[in-house]
Amino acid sequence: LPVNTRCKLEVSNFQQPYIVNRTFMLAKEASLADNNTDVRLIGEKLFRGVSAKDQCYLMKQVLNFTLEDVLLPQSDRFQPYMQEVVPFLTKLSNQLSSCHISGDDQNIQKNVRRLKETVKKLGESGEIKAIGELDLLFMSLRNACV
């Protein structure tokens, strides 16, 4: 079996009204504090050169970066949403822990690196932007991994 058969999430993860709503509320709260609307982290550029079958692996990398380097440093902000959404996203990350790809992941790493560099370059406002795009992260995980 190809390695990326493990790159799967159950659709039920994305059908729980309460936590879905909280995730989108968190994104909205953060996006109100984001005034750099010209920069988009999750969008077409992120998926450029990445085949559909590898997009879940790409999103796993983005999810892990978001959890470790964005949500944890900002964990005291945007309450009460943050304390509910972080465990939900951590659960998704754990479900993707065995998601790997066997082929060349050069484009994936390049695209993820570009996203990380953009967030780091923008500093705290980059972290706010990433939180404001949790709705896009949610949709991208759903589209790529279900």
């Epitope: 879905v20 989108f24 909205k28 988009r40 969008g43 077409e44 450029r48 709705d135 896009l136």
Partner: antibody
């Protein structure tokens, strides 16, 4: 300021083609895409398709598949929409609008181009 | 494809009225809904995106709400400049679909 300026009105015969242009200014053209929306006289808005100014990737509404071609010229920050095999019911105002194509609203619109198809 | 159903198709109201327009999606679209205002002979103008976020330059008397399949646009106190046609739009991934429109007329 950020704006989209479309080409002038066109009158075409049935069976002909029309190519409408949309020149962008005031923002980084390749950071967004362009959607095309049309509106027949007295009717509502109808989405035709989208093109990425970054990659040139396109996504057309099923109804226009095979009859429409959307292109961009990044050197002039201009998007184009060509519609072929025109019929009288293609008479409409054609709008270009800025969006990123990925769960994005259309925040900036062109002024519209009236295309009249008549024999 | 997702269908957007708007109601009512025509609405008569007076200056100062509170007005509500509804839009229903044929399947759940989370908060990916926008509202536009269009005046005769003019291009549409974005009012609300992501169901409830006010677009830059849009007056604060406009507000949006909803999640999933049912959405509303509310004008808290109708002004003379608000008589126009309003459209909802599903902000789908690479695809878009508009509602049929609601024409807001002076009573």
């Amino acid at each position: 300021q950020v704006q989209l300026v479309e080409s002038g009105a066109e009158v075409k015969k049935p069976g002909a083609s029309v190519k409408v242009s949309c020149k962008a200014s005031g923002y980084t053209f390749t950071s967004y895409g362009i959607s095309w929306v049309r509106q027949a006289p007295g009717q509502g808005l109808e989405w035709m398709g989208w093109i990425s100014a970054y990659t040139g990737n396109t996504n057309y509404a099923q109804k226009f598949q095979g009859r429409v071609t959307m292109t961009t010229d990044t050197s002039t920050s201009t998007a184009y929409m060509e519609l072929r095999s025109l019929r009288s019911d293609d008479t409409a105002v054609y709008y270009c609008a800025r969006d990123r194509g990925y769960y994005d609203a259309f925040d900036i619109w062109g002024q519209g181009t009236l295309v009249t198809v008549s024999s | 494809d997702i269908q957007m159903t708007q109601s009512p198709s025509t609405l008569s109201a007076s200056i100062g009225d509170r007005v509500t327009i509804t839009c229903r999606a044929s399947e759940g679209i989370y908060h990916w809904l926008a509202w536009y205002q269009q005046k005769p002979g003019k291009a549409p103008k974005l009012l609300i995106y992501k169901a409830s976020s006010l677009a830059s330059g849009a007056p604060s008397r406009f507000s949006g709400s909803g999640f999933g399949t049912d959405f509303t646009l509310t004008i808290s106190s109708l002004q003379p400049d608000d008589f126009a046609t309003y459209y909802c739009q599903q902000m789908g991934e690479w695809k878009a679909a508009f509602g049929g429109g609601t024409k807001l007329e002076i009573k």
